[in-house]
Amino acid sequence: AVDLTLLANLRLTDPQRFFLTCVSGEAGAGRGSDAWGPPLLLEKDDRIVRTPPGPPLRLARNGSHQVTLRGFSKPSDLVGVFSCVGGAGARRTRVIYVHNSPGAHLLPDKVTHTVNKGDTAVLSARVHKEKQTDVIWKSNGSYFYTLDWHEAQDGRFLLQLPNVQPPSSGIYSATYLEASPLGSAFFRLIVRGCGAGRWGPGCTKECPGCLHGGVCHDHDGECVCPPGFTGTRCEQACREGRFGQSCQEQCPGISGCRGLTFCLPDPYGCSCGSGWRGSQCQEACAPGHFGADCRLQCQCQNGGTCDRFSGCVCPSGWHGVHCEKSDRIPQILNMASELEFNLETMPRINCAAAGNPFPVRGSIELRKPDGTVLLSTKAIVEPEKTTAEFEVPRLVLADSGFWECRVSTSGGQDSRRFKVNVKVPPVPLAAPRLLTKQSRQLVVSPLVSFSGDGPISTVRLHYRPQDSTMDWSTIVVDPSENVTLMNLRPKTGYSVRVQLSRPGEGGEGAWGPPTLMTTDCPEPLLQPWLEGWHVEGTDRLRVSWSLPLVPGPLVGDGFLLRLWDGTRGQERRENVSSPQARTALLTGLTPGTHYQLDVQLYHCTLLGPASPPAHVLLPPSGPPAPRHLHAQALSDSEIQLTWKHPEALPGPISKYVVEVQVAGGAGDPLWIDVDRPEETSTIIRGLNASTRYLFRMRASIQGLGDWSNTVEESTLGNGLQAEGPVQESRAAEEGLDQ
C-alpha cells in the first residue's frame, strides 16, 4: 500500500487552530515533476457533505512530502469530508477523513467501519441532543432510509446493512429531519472486495494474518498497519509518537500523538494513534489495553507488563505477543519482512533460527505460497544460531505472495511469514527517440515507456550499422539523460535499440524494438571566395566565385548565395543547385540598396564556411522609358532612330543607351551610348545590308531606366558586309562613339 497518512488535529477549542496534514513516506512524493509523479493534493470534498461557503482554506507545502490545510474560521468549516491524494500512476491513492461536529444532534459511535464482503455492517448514531422527529439516513448524499424517532435503542439509531458488497462503500449520514445537516452523524463504510482473510482477483489468496489491528488489502494482500505499527504483518511496534510504514514520521508537538486522528489508505480508514482513544483521541488507554483506539488487549503472561503503545513487554526468557513463548522454544531470527527478486532468477534465501535444543538443517523448512515445501541445501551452524540456505527453483509470477520459514524442534516450533515480490524486468514498448543528428554522431533520448516493473537502474543503448552482421556496440547511460553516440560513419543508417534493467540479479529486460537513425552527410569544409561581381541593372547583379583546389571529389551539392540588406534587416538567399557552377545572376534586387554578399558550399542540409563578405551598392532605379521610338532605314548600312524624351523625369538625363540586335540572331545584343542627352535622334551606321534589326533604348540618370518599346527595321539591299553598327548623333556627325 502507498505510505500516505492524513492527520487531523482534533483540539477543537478553537477552529482556527484546527489543521489537517497529509504526509507521504513515498520516495519523492509531492515534488510534482515527471520523475516523481503528481504532487500531494489535500482538499475539502463538498460533493456529499455540503457546507455553507466560507473564506478559502490555505494550503501550505512543507517540503516535498507534506501538505497542510489551515484557515478554518468557524466550527461548521470543519464538518464534512476531506481527502488527500498521493502516489503516482497505478499507485495513486486517496485517503479520506470524515469530520463530525462535536455539538451535533447525532454523533457516530464509530466513524470508520471496515467490513468484509458479505458481512453485516451496523452503523450506530448516538443521540447527543434529542429531537422528536424522524431520522433520515443517507448514502453518498442520496436518501437511503428513515427511522421513526421512537426506534432509538439505548439512545442510539442503528442502520443495519446485511450482506454488504463493495458498491455499498461510501459516506453515510444520520440526520434529524428537522435539524441542520451540519448536525448529522457522518460515517465512512469501507467494504473490502473479499470475504474475511482473503484477497486477490478471485479472492483465492489467503491474507498474511495482520496483527495489532492491521487490515489485509483485498487487492495486493499487504497489511495496512495501524499508526504506530510496522512490518509485513504489523508485528512490530514503533517507538512512542512515531508512525508511517517504517515508523519514519514523528507526531508534532510535545504531547506526541494525543489529539490526532490518523487516516490511512483503504481498507484501514481512520483511528486514533497507538495508545489513544475517544472521539477526540485525547484519552489514554485504560490499563490492559493498547494500540490504535486502544482496541487491543494485552493479556500478558509469565510476568509480562502491558505498554499502551506496544503491547506486552516480556521479561527475560520469554517472547511472543503475550509473552507466551519460552526462549527455549525455537525462534526464527531477523527474517526480512519483504524480499524482492526478478522473474526467472534462482535466488538463495537464508533463514536463521535459535533455540534449545539447537535447530539443525533438517528442522528448518521454507514453504512457498502454493504450499510447496523446500528443504535447505546447506546450513551454517554458529554458537547462537543455525542459518539454513535454500536454493529456490526458477521464479515465476505465481511465486509472488507470502512465504513462510518454519522451524521445528522437540522444544516446539516457530514460523515467520515474509512477502516475496517477483518483479518483471522492464521491456521498452517503444524505440528510442532521435533528438539531433550530425555526420558522425546521433543524440538520442533513451528512456521510453516500458512494460514490467521499475525502478529503472540502468539503460543500455545497443547500436550498429543497418544490415550489418557485426557485433552490436553498447553504451550504458544514465536513465534521465540524453545520449550522444559518437564516432559514427557519415550518411549511414544505424539500428538502435534500448535495453532496460531494474535492480537485482536477473533484472535485465529484453531488448526493445529497433529504430533506424541515419547520420547526416559530411560537412562541406571548403571555403569559397568571391572573384567579382558587376551590376547588370538597377535590380540585377552577376556574381562569380572560386573554390580552392583540393585532391579527391568535391564534397558538396551546390552553393548558397546570401545578400544581407542591413537597412531593412532582410536576407535574400539564392540556391545554386550545381556544385560545378561558378557564376550566378541575381535578379529582383532592390535598386539603390547596399548589400553584404557572401557564398558558401552546402552538402545535404549542412552549410560549409562562408566566403569573406563583399559589399555591393546597387544603383538607384533610373528614369522612365523614352517614348515613341521609331526606326527608319536610310541606306543599306544605316538606320535612323527617333524618339521623344521620357516624361516626369526625376533629374537631368546623363545619356541614352541603344540596344541593337539582329532579329532572330543568337548572339548577344550590342549596347551603344548616346552621350548627348538633349538629342531625340541618332543614326546607327555600319549595319549589314538586307538585314532585319531590333532596337530599343533607355535613359540613364544615376542609374539605368526602363527599356522603351522594341522597334524593327531592315537595312536596304545590295550593300557590302559592314564591320558593325556605329552611331551618329544629328548634331555631331564627326567623333563617332563606337
Epitope: 424522524d134 448524499g141 436518501y143 427511522l147 421513526d148 426506534e151 440526520t175 429531519l177 445537516p181
Partner: antibody
Framework: EVQLLESGGGLVQPGGSLRLSCAAS????????MKWVRQAPGKGLEWVSS????????RYADSVKGRFTISRDNSKNTLYLQMNSLRAEDTAVYYC????????????????????WGQGTLVTVSS | DIQMTQSPGTLSLSPGERATLSCRAS???????LAWYQQKPGQAPRLLIY???SRATGIPDRFSGSGSGTDFTLTISRLEPEDFAVYYC?????????FGPG
C-alpha cells in the same frame, strides 16, 4: 420506472371492513416511508396514515385512529390499509404515496415530499 | 396542529397570463417543509415544489415557489393550457403532513 398500484376499493356498508393494497415496483420499497392519503368526492386531500420502512412504526390521523391499521410486506413490495368500522365520511378515493427526502436549497434541513402517487382506489361507504 | 389556508379559492385566467397562488400557515413553518402539488380531474396529485422553492424532477421552469414563515407563494409565470388544475400546498411538522384546501 416507479409505479404504485392500489386495489381493494369498493362499496361497503357502514360498520363494515375493507382491505386496500398498494403494489410497488421500480424502487427499493423497503427503504421508504409510505403513506395513505384520501380525497372525498369534490374535496381536498387528507393524510390518513404513515408507515416507516421497518414496518414497526406507524402514524394515523385522529379521524381514523383505532379503526384503520397500516402495514407493509417488504418481501412482497406491498403496502396495506385495513379499514374497520367504516363510516359514510370515509367515502373517498384512497391514494398510496411514497415519501422522498430532498436536500433543500441553501444549507437548511432536509425537505420531504410525496414524489410518487398511485392512481387511487375508490371506497364507498353507504347503506 | 398547523392549519393551512389557500387563496384565492378560484383563480380565473387565460393562457399566457401569470398566476400567483397564496398559501398561509396558522403558525410559522420551516421553508424546508412546504411543498406544492398539482391535481388534474381524475388524476393523482403530482409533486411540483419541495422546500418552498425547489422544483421537483421534470417540472418546467415556469413554476416557481417562494416565501417563508407563514406566507408562501406558487407562481406560474406564463400559463399553458395544461396548467389549469387544482393546486395544494402541504406542510410537514411533527411527523405529520397537512394539506391546504386547494
Amino acid at each position: 420506472e416507479v409505479q404504485l398500484l392500489e386495489s381493494g376499493g369498493g362499496l361497503v356498508q357502514p360498520g363494515g371492513s375493507l382491505r386496500l393494497s398498494c403494489a410497488a415496483s421500480g424502487f427499493t420499497f423497503s427503504m421508504y416511508v409510505m403513506k395513505w392519503v384520501r380525497q372525498a368526492p369534490g374535496k381536498g386531500l387528507e393524510w390518513v396514515s404513515s408507515i416507516y420502512p421497518s414496518g414497526g412504526y406507524t402514524r394515523y390521523a385522529d379521524s381514523v385512529k383505532g379503526r384503520f391499521t397500516i402495514s407493509r410486506d417488504n418481501s412482497k413490495n406491498t403496502l396495506y390499509l385495513q379499514m374497520n368500522s367504516l363510516r359514510a365520511e370515509d367515502t373517498a378515493v384512497y391514494y398510496c404515496a411514497r415519501v422522498n427526502y430532498y436536500d433543500s436549497s441553501g444549507y437548511g434541513p432536509i425537505a420531504p415530499g410525496l414524489d410518487y402517487w398511485g392512481q387511487g382506489t375508490l371506497v364507498t361507504v353507504s347503506s | 396542529d398547523i392549519q393551512m389556508t389557500q387563496s384565492p379559492g378560484t383563480l380565473s385566467l387565460s393562457p399566457g397570463e401569470r398566476a400567483t397562488l397564496s398559501c398561509r400557515a396558522s403558525q410559522s413553518v420551516s421553508s424546508s417543509y412546504l411543498a406544492w402539488y398539482q391535481q388534474k380531474p381524475g388524476q393523482a396529485p403530482r409533486l411540483l415544489i419541495y422546500g418552498a422553492s425547489s422544483r421537483a424532477t421534470g417540472i418546467p421552469d415556469r413554476f416557481s415557489g417562494s416565501g417563508s414563515g407563514t406566507d408562501f407563494t406558487l407562481t406560474i409565470s406564463r400559463l399553458e393550457p395544461e396548467d389549469f388544475a387544482v393546486y395544494y400546498c402541504q406542510q410537514y411538522g411533527s411527523s405529520l403532513f397537512t394539506f391546504g384546501p386547494g
